[in-house]
Interface confidence: low
């Protein structure tokens, strides 16, 4: 969460002289309350935009727009504080619109915009517009808040941004999974145009309960240049227990731009549908005997395991 680096932050418009300033997120009207305070914003609109930095990087930004109510309180409106809170980290960034001239009613509703908050893919933010001065402690609130979820790197607009591209967003592995005879599963996917290793992770679950009953990891060594964009195949021997039949396959690349933090792609294979005529297996076969875990490597990013923003389901 940061401000776009190079844009001159402008808030002036016809009929209003205005300047944008960095804010500590604590306007002094909290400390020096004013008796007469403006009403809250009428509407806040937030959408995603993509902007280029002065270094030519494409970054996702929040486009925030709000309008004023058409009441006399605009005569006491001295500016606005925009606050963006990243919900998973509690990180907050604020800017202040400082009005250098008095607002007057004119023929159309006053509208303000700001598009300089740089955000991260797959993160949720709370955007608050606070009119200034803020109200006295028991006064009516004069702010409005809205939450906004920034799409992940699978989203078409996000794919081409620098944070997504450096996480491997342009790679589409087009994973296919095929069940073979003799408890085997063949996973195929398309290699990217970089000589980088891949890891294919298989985790199997019982159909009735979400219990992991089998876990194996296979390495694919870095392909040669002539193998770029070709299909790679990995065959897994599955658990011998027929109830361990719900498979989650994940392909993790190790592109040099993101190493262990690259976007992973996953597919899920459900258990086969068993018809009513199927003869049930002996009960003993249902006892969840845990298979040994195998194939771990120093590439395994344990604190990412199960964190949904790394797993892209197709």
């Amino acid at each position: 969460l940061r401000l776009l680096d190079h844009r001159a932050l402008v808030c002036s418009q016809p009929g209003l002289n205005c300047t944008v300033k960095n804010s500590t997120c604590l306007d002094d009207s909290w400390i020096h309350p004013r008796n007469l305070t403006p009403s809250s914003p009428k509407n806040i609109y937030i959408n995603l935009s993509v902007s280029s930095t002065q270094h030519g990087e494409l970054v996702p930004v929040l486009h925030v727009e709000w309008t004023l109510q058409t009441d006399a309180s605009i005569l006491y409106l001295e500016g606005a504080e925009l606050s963006v809170l990243q919900l998973n980290t509690n990180e907050r960034l604020c800017v202040r619109f400082e009005f250098l001239s008095k607002l007057r009613h004119h023929h159309r509703r006053w509208r303000f915009t700001f598009s300089h908050f740089v955000v991260d893919p797959d993160q949720e933010y709370e955007v608050t517009v606070h009119h200034l001065p803020k109200p006295i402690p028991d006064g009516d609130p004069n702010h409005q808040s809205k939450n906004f979820l920034v799409p992940d790197c699978e989203h078409a607009r996000m794919k081409v941004t620098t944070p997504c591209m450096s996480s491997g967003s342009l790679w589409d592995p087009n994973i296919t999974v095929e069940t073979l005879e003799a408890h085997q599963l063949r996973v195929s996917f398309t290699l990217w145009n970089e000589s980088t290793p891949y890891q294919v992770l298989l985790e199997s679950f019982s159909d009735s309960e979400n219990h992991s009953c089998f876990d194996v990891v296979k390495q694919i060594f870095a392909p040669r240049q002539e193998e770029f964009h070709q299909r790679a195949n990995v065959t897994f021997t599955l658990s011998k227990f027929h109830w361990c039949c719900h498979h989650h396959v994940q392909v993790q690349p190790f592109f040099s731009s993101c190493l262990n933090d690259c976007l992973r792609h996953a597919v899920t294979v459900p258990c086969p549908v068993i018809s009513n005529t199927t003869v049930p297996k002996p009960v003993a076969d249902y006892i969840p005997l845990w298979e040994p875990r195998s194939g771990s490597s120093d590439y395994k990013d344990d604190d990412d395991k199960g964190s949904s923003h790394h797993h892209h389901h197709h």
Partner: antibody
Framework: EVQLVESGGGLVQPGGSLRLSCAAS????????MNWVRQAPGKGLEWVSF????????YYADSVKGRFTISRDNAKNSLYLQMNSLRDEDTAVYYC???????????WGQGTTVTVSS | DIQMTQSPSSLSASVGDRVTITCRAS??????LAWYQQKPGKFPELLIY???TLQSGVPSRFSGSGSGTDFTLTISSLQPEDVATYYC?????????FGPGTKVDIK
Amino acid sequence: EVQLVESGGGLVQPGGSLRLSCAASGFTFSSYSMNWVRQAPGKGLEWVSFISARSSTIYYADSVKGRFTISRDNAKNSLYLQMNSLRDEDTAVYYCARPKVGGGMDVWGQGTTVTVSS
Amino acid sequence: DIQMTQSPSSLSASVGDRVTITCRASQGISNYLAWYQQKPGKFPELLIYAASTLQSGVPSRFSGSGSGTDFTLTISSLQPEDVATYYCQKYNRAPFTFGPGTKVDIK
């Protein structure tokens, strides 16, 4: 301009601590893994530590494991190396370096000098 | 851990000479190898990555080759400004070890 600037080096006694900082500018710091590399006087380059973009993966050279801690603050575009229980052999110029898309490290700081001596 | 060795440890050559430095990994590292040039009192600069890809801005007299365990850095025609120490580095997985370096100077 893409830039890395190290700071925090200095003279410290054996057993003491120092915290090095690396300020990044000119690129989207939060998208890149980062490394610390050091060079003892008259010696070769020694890789010290690695931290991934979201701090989910951290590696250390055996020579510093348990004594050094790498961290980062993406909001401040900063990389850190906390060095405890310093030894004479930790005397070196410490560089922060950014990995290149495709391999290697293409952006290096000018380095900060750490001298461990009684 | 994989060890990186370089040979020779130092060499002297005349301006215009073809210079070859070798780097060997104790186990295969595919093409996960970079070469750096470090001039006295300066920070290292990336010359070659992915064993053979020239970093932008690096003169074309520098080239790299090899895969697996054996790698070569070649300067096709040595220039006075090439006086430096050259390091190889593996980056397939941690530790991202450097070779001990090869010091190149002019006869």
